[in-house]
C-alpha cells in the first residue's frame, strides 16, 4: 500500500550534468543545457516528484511526473520506460507498482540518487546512450559504481 | 556531511524510563529513516526499531515492542528513543543511525549513549 | 537469539588477506541483502558494505563482500593495523521489516 504525501518541483541531471526532459514524442532525453536552456525549455525539463508513504518502507518512494498539456506519469512497465497519461494517484493498493521507485541516496554521496523500481527489484533508472539520443532506460544494475544509474536532482520550489 | 548528535550518559533506575535524543545536522532530516540500535557491554548489535520523519511512521523490534517508544521533531531534526520499565539488561550504548539508502542501511551514526541501569 | 553466524575472531599478519563468514538461512540471507559494518575499539560501528558487495565513498577497495546461498563473507586484503576492530554482518528483509546482525568478529593484526 502506497499513500501519498507531498510533491516538490525538480530538474533531474545524469552525472555529466545533461538535464532530464520530455521531447515532443514524449520520450524521456537527456540534453546537454544550460541554465537558461533549462528554464526555456520549462515545463518540459520540471518534473514532479511525488513522495508516498509505504506500508512496507523499502526506502523513499515516489513518482515522477511532467505537466506539459496534461500531466504524465513515468511507468517501467515490463521494463520499458514511458510516461502514462495520468496523475499520481492518491492512493495504491499494492506493495509493488510501475510508477513507483524508491529514491536513494548513495551511500558517501548525500546528492548523488538512485531510483530503483518497486515493481522490479534489482533495476534502476539509468541514462543511457542510443545512437545520438540519451535515453531514460530502466537498468538492471550489473556493475559496481554504475555512474549510469546515478543522478543529481534540483528542487526548483 | 551528516552529523548525529546524542544526548550524554545517563544513570537510572530499574523499572524507570530513559529518553536518549538524537540531532542531525548538515543533511536532509524528514525523509530518512533514524533507527536505534543499542550494544550491551562486550555485546554485538541489537536494533530496536526506526521512524521515518516525514510520515511518522514507526517499525518496532517484537522484542522491544511495547516497551520502546521512537518519536521525531522535524522542526529541530531530533529524533527521540525513550525505553521504559528499565533493567539491568537495559544497561548498554544506545546509537542513533540515519539511513538514507534504505531504511536498514545504516550509513551515519551517532556517537553512542550509555545508559546504565543501576539500583 | 543471534540469527547470523560469525567466527568470534580471525588474525592475520600485515598484508595478509582474511575472510570473515556469515552464515543464516533462506529466511535472511538466502532471500535478502547483507551488509558489513566495521566497529573500532572504543567508536560507533561504520557501514563498510552495503547490499552485497557495494562499498560506500570513503571505503577503501581492499574490502569486498560476497553473497552465496545463506552465506556470506567479508575479505579485506593488504590488511592493516588499522583494520583491528570488530566487524558485522546484517541482514534485511526487503519485503517485511526486521534486521538481523551476527554475533560479530573480532579481527586481530598479528
Known amino acids: 500500500y502506497f499513500g501519498k504525501l507531498e510533491s516538490k518541483l525538480s530538474v533531474i541531471r545524469n552525472l555529466n550534468d545533461q538535464v532530464l526532459f520530455i521531447d515532443q514524442g514524449n520520450r524521456p532525453l537527456f540534453e546537454d543545457m544550460t541554465d537558461s536552456d533549462c528554464r526555456d525549455n520549462a515545463p518540459r525539463t520540471i518534473f514532479i516528484i511525488s513522495m508516498y508513504k509505504d506500508s512496507q518502507p523499502r526506502g523513499m518512494a515516489v513518482t515522477i511526473s511532467v505537466k506539459c498539456e496534461k500531466i504524465s506519469t513515468l511507468s517501467c512497465e515490463n521494463k520499458i520506460i514511458s510516461f502514462k497519461e495520468m496523475n499520481p494517484p492518491d492512493n495504491i493498493k499494492d506493495t509493488k507498482s510501475d510508477i513507483i521507485f524508491f529514491q536513494r541516496s548513495v551511500p558517501g554521496h548525500d546528492n548523488k540518487m538512485q531510483f530503483e523500481s518497486s515493481s522490479y527489484e534489482g533495476y534502476f533508472l539509468a541514462c543511457e546512450k542510443e545512437r545520438d539520443l540519451f535515453k531514460l532506460i530502466l537498468k538492471k544494475e550489473d556493475e559496481l559504481g554504475d555512474r549510469s544509474i546515478m543522478f543529481t536532482v534540483q528542487n526548483e520550489d | 556531511e551528516v552529523q548525529l548528535v546524542q544526548s550524554g550518559a545517563e544513570v537510572k533506575k530499574p523499572g524507570s524510563s530513559v529518553k536518549v535524543s538524537c540531532k542531525a545536522s548538515g543533511g536532509t532530516f524528514k525523509s530518512y529513516a533514524i533507527s536505534w540500535v543499542r550494544q550491551a557491554p562486550g555485546q554485538g548489535l541489537e536494533w530496536m526499531g526506526n521512524i521515518i520523519p516525514m510520515t511518522g511512521q514507526t517499525y518496532y523490534a517484537q522484542k522491544f515492542q511495547g516497551r520502546v517508544t521512537i518519536t521525531a521533531d522535524e522542526s529541530t531534526s531530533t529524533a527521540y528513543m525513550e525505553l521504559s520499565s528499565l533493567r539491568s539488561e537495559d544497561t548498554a550504548v544506545y546509537y542513533c543511525?540515519?539511513?538514507?539508502?534504505?531504511?536498514?542501511?545504516?550509513?551515519?551514526w551517532g556517537q553512542g549513549t550509555l545508559v546504565t541501569v543501576s539500583s | 537469539d543471534i540469527v547470523l553466524t560469525q567466527p568470534p575472531s580471525v588474525s592475520g599478519a600485515p598484508g595478509q588477506r582474511v575472510t570473515i563468514s556469515c552464515s543464516g538461512s533462506s529466511s535472511n540471507i538466502g532471500n535478502h541483502y547483507v551488509n558489513w559494518y566495521q566497529q573500532l575499539p572504543g567508536t560507533a560501528p561504520k557501514l563498510l558494505i552495503y547490499r552485497n558487495n557495494h562499498r560506500p565513498s570513503g571505503v577503501p577497495d581492499r574490502f569486498s563482500g560476497s553473497k552465496s546461498g545463506t552465506s556470506a563473507s567479508l575479505a579485506i586484503t593488504g590488511l592493516q593495523s588499522e583494520d583491528e576492530a570488530d566487524y558485522y554482518c546484517?541482514?534485511?528483509?526487503?519485503?517485511?521489516?526486521?534486521?538481523?546482525f551476527g554475533g560479530g568478529t573480532k579481527l586481530t593484526v598479528l
Open positions: 543511525a540515519r539511513a538514507a539508502y534504505h531504511p536498514l542501511v545504516f550509513d551515519n
Open positions: 546484517q541482514s534485511w528483509d526487503y519485503s517485511g521489516f526486521s534486521t538481523v
